[in-house]
Amino acid sequence: HTAAQDNCTCPTNKMTVCSPDGPGGRCQCRALGSGVAVDCSTLTSECLLLKARMSAPKNARTLVRPNEHALVDNDGLYDPDCDPEGRFKARQCNQTSVCWCVNSVGVRRTDKGDLSLRCDELVRTHHILIDLRHRPTAGAFNHSDLDAELRRLFRERYRLHPKFVAAVHYEQPTIQIELRQNTSQKAAGDVDIGDAAYYFERDVKGESLFQGRGGLDLRVRGEPLQVERTLIYYLDEIPPKFSMKRLT
């Protein structure tokens, strides 16, 4: 995207400040909150987006637990620490020196502790289940048409490699989209499933992160698919470590 055009903007992230000060007068965009330069040809990492969002906080996300190892984002929004690549740092702390460990999508996966808490590595969320309920329609969507459109959406709007959309399940009115991406599968330049899920979640809530006025327009054979609730389940490569007290 070049500054020679009237609109020096970031198509994939509206939470940026852009100016024509890149190499050769190119449009360069920096994330709000962190000032980190972002690549506007792909999705911005969720960590940088959350950091930007803290300047105008909205309702926190709520996640539900599908099994013993799934995580619930009970903590809502926080101002995260991101590494130079924009990923969540494994250990997050607040201003009162309370610390906890997070996974690659920034959800807490340990009890809270103090500054002595160690988080040895950023544990990867390798399986995401997006559970949707769509608004009533004249009839059920054709499953194969729905599958094709949702795969197309993740492939083309969110730029996720097709192999990472593992399955699309449908039992009217519930749609489930399974995203799977192991550490070994993710190549340089691949969109992270966590970032794709976050963009999708914001889209279906009418809070699109993309530049422009359009928002998500999802249709199956011309019929609008309107989502009335979204639940996202995260499963990590290593199960979370919570004390028994929390689980009772």
């Epitope: 198509p11 040809s41 083309e156 730029r159 340089a188 691949d190 011309g222």
Partner: antibody
């Protein structure tokens, strides 16, 4: 069926202007990024411009920046390319092509039949 | 801007031969590469997107591979109807540059 039909090509003198159009049918036009691609006689394909599904973003190849403008009217299912200050090297068949779903950047799965623009005095 | 270099620029092979065309990006483009076929006097046709995904309706003798900077289009068994010029194209971001093309002929 899914179809793109270009129109508006013709012979034009250097320095003059021309607008070509592309009428879309058979799909939800407003949900797709759209592109113009051109092919000079006997030459390869050259991408010219993109406009996102909602008109929020445009991009151009360097050689046409400041001279060509891509636009769309989603209510009319029509894509446009306004070409000003035309040069001899703009002589080509101009194709419109469908790009990404709710996006601009993707491969082109639907192409029009093309319209020939000849810039000559 | 990222340059796309295709090789060879032309080739001649016999019916039934395995044909390989390569495309190299001057910088990494992940899997954002497409292959098109353009028969003489016809409109280009999408064969492969996302480097290796076959477009619906395209014969399975066509396949694509690669990621990052090096990509390959393979025709496993060349058929007379495959005579055409083949183009690669990057679509990670603008400009969506095409390669110079590879003209495939039958011996």
């Amino acid at each position: 069926q899914v179809q793109l039909v270009e129109s508006g090509g013709g012979v034009v003198q250097p320095g003059r202007s021309l607008r070509v159009s592309c009428a879309a049918s058979g799909f939800i036009f407003s949900t797709y990024g759209m592109h113009w691609v051109r092919q000079a006689p006997g030459k390869g394909l050259e991408w010219v411009a993109v406009i996102w599904y909602d008109g929020s973003n445009e991009d151009y190849v360097d050689s046409v920046k400041g001279r060509f403008t891509i636009s769309r009217d989603n209510s009319k299912n029509t894509l446009y390319l306004q070409m000003n200050s035309l040069r001899g090297e703009d002589t080509a068949v101009y194709y419109c092509a469908r790009g990404g779903y709710n996006s601009g950047w993707w491969a082109f799965d639907v192409w029009g039949q093309g319209t020939l623009v000849t810039v000559s005095s | 801007d990222i340059q796309m270099t295709q090789s060879p620029s032309s080739l001649s092979a016999s019916v039934g031969d395995r044909v390989t065309i390569t495309c190299r990006a001057s910088q990494g483009i992940s899997h954002f590469l497409a292959w098109y076929q353009q028969k003489p006097g016809k409109v280009p046709k999408l064969l492969i997107y996302a480097a290796s995904t076959l477009q619906s309706g395209v014969p399975s003798r066509f396949s694509g591979s690669g990621s990052g900077t090096d990509f390959t289009l393979t025709i496993s068994s060349l058929q007379p109807e495959d005579v055409a010029t083949y183009y690669c194209q990057k679509f990670n971001s603008a400009p969506l540059t095409f390669g110079g093309g590879t003209k495939v002929e039958i011996k």
